[in-house]
Amino acid sequence: LEVQVPEDPVVALVGTDATLCCSFSPEPGFSLAQLNLIWQLTDTKQLVHSFAEGQDQGSAYANRTALFPDLLAQGNASLRLQRVRVADEGSFTCFVSIRDFGSAAVSLQVAAPYSKPSMTLEPNKDLRPGDTVTITCSSYRGYPEAEVFWQDGQGVPLTGNVTTSQMANEQGLFDVHSVLRVVLGANGTYSCLVRNPVLQQDAHGSVTITGQPMTFP
């Protein structure tokens, strides 16, 4: 029995619903009374949802899963996962049993966009060319871990003297803090780019220092 799932991971935003697609080819004369379907976590084999004896046996996964009952008879064994959380990320196996059996695994990739970075400067007054300043770029509640890039006003990457830390909160979302230590020129713009590698989403922040005063676009 051939069970088909998408090759590419299913990407779902935190808090939204995701559909984990799974299908099989019913033979002529197939009825739902003949179908047994199991969804489970691939690694731990934890039961997620099942269909047996002609009826939905329900969710065993925080009551956030559902099948598509009207589509099962056509061979659509997809699973709806509601209110996706970071902890849901991973591989799900769809096991189908009729008079033969088959299974396939589909990956769920969870993502959350990062907020627009906030920029802070230390020290933030009485700055002169030649002073060393610390610029902090902070972006919040994203997933997975971000890639952080710094550049100057001419677009030249700044890779030295950069320290980036990422801390996960209770929901598994990351807060990013990236610190750039730089010696001031006569004036200059410093930009921070926080990239979500899954969503290919970039969040930008910048600070421009023009002697006095400073501006934070």
Epitope: L1, E2, A33, Q34, N36, I38, Q40, K45, Q46, L47, S50, A52, E53, Q57, A60, F95, S97, I98, R99, D100, F101, G102, S103
Partner: antibody, heavy 118, light 110 residues
Framework: EVQLLESGGGLLQPGGSLRLSCAAS????????MHWVRQAPGKGLEWVAA????????YYADSVEGRFTISRDNSKNTLYLQMNSLRAEDTAVYYC???????????WGQGTTVTVSS | QSVLTQPPSASGTPGQRVTISCSGS????????VNWYQQLPGTAPKLLIY???LRPSGVPDRFSGSKSGTSASLAISGLQSEDEADYYC???????????FGGGTKLTVL
């Protein structure tokens, strides 16, 4: 008539190897999953391994994983069980069974006896 | 030790009704179904009940099955001497990815 006929059993020493065969007839062999189930003397039934119709999905009991290999040749309507590194506790009657709806096994062979003893 | 739990023995007199229980878990009987097999002395097992309550053709209607939650039972009414056999329940265990059998119940017709 639907029939399953096992063969290949015998007496051998611990560490030895054996291949069981199961010849199927009377049904479309290539459309059904198949199992091996065993029964030690005076004991209950123990599921050993299963294979789906085209051999793409295989499952084993923990007790035989890594030592036994289930396979099938649909052109010959035959199911196999290759048993390596045999142990005394593998002594049993081995049954070949046909998969049926709802995880059931609706046709059983007569069994073939495997005895592992030094 | 079996994943599915059955009483090791049961007995009854001819004409009586006997019931054999099979206890499982959320990941086997609770998630899927249960099947019952009869093994007469010296013979191969035979499918008696599938999908908890269905009888294959040729199985007398004296045999019936039911399932509730994570447990199942096999009932034999109008007990006959030829019903003396070992009875096994079985299921698919979704947490082990294996087929599992109960330890078997030896039915004696007194």
């Amino acid at each position: 008539e639907v029939q399953l006929l096992e063969s290949g059993g015998g007496l051998l020493q611990p560490g030895g190897s054996l291949r069981l065969s199961c010849a199927a007839s009377g049904f479309s062999f290539s459309s059904y999953g198949m199992h091996w189930v065993r029964q030690a003397p005076g004991k209950g039934l123990e599921w050993v391994a299963a294979i789906n119709s085209d051999g793409s999905r295989i499952y084993y009991a923990d007790s035989v994983e890594g030592r036994f290999t289930i396979s099938r040749d649909n052109s010959k309507n035959t199911l196999y069980l290759q048993m390596n590194s045999l142990r005394a506790e593998d002594t049993a009657v081995y049954y070949c069974t046909k998969y049926y709806y709802h995880y059931a096994m609706d046709v059983w062979g007569q069994g073939t006896t495997v005895t592992v003893s030094s | 030790q079996s994943v599915l739990t059955q009483p090791p023995s049961a007995s009854g007199t001819p004409g009586q009704r006997v019931t054999i229980s099979c206890s499982g878990s959320r990941s086997d009987i609770g998630a899927t179904t249960v099947n019952w097999y009869q093994q007469l002395p010296g013979t191969a097992p035979k499918l008696l009940i599938y999908q908890s309550h269905l009888r294959p053709s040729g199985v007398p209607d004296r045999f019936s099955g039911s399932k509730s939650g994570t447990s199942a039972s096999l009932a034999i009414s109008g007990l006959q001497s030829e019903d003396e056999a070992d009875y096994y329940c079985a299921s698919w265990d979704a947490s082990l990815n294996t087929w599992v059998f109960g330890g078997g119940t030896k039915l004696t017709v007194l």
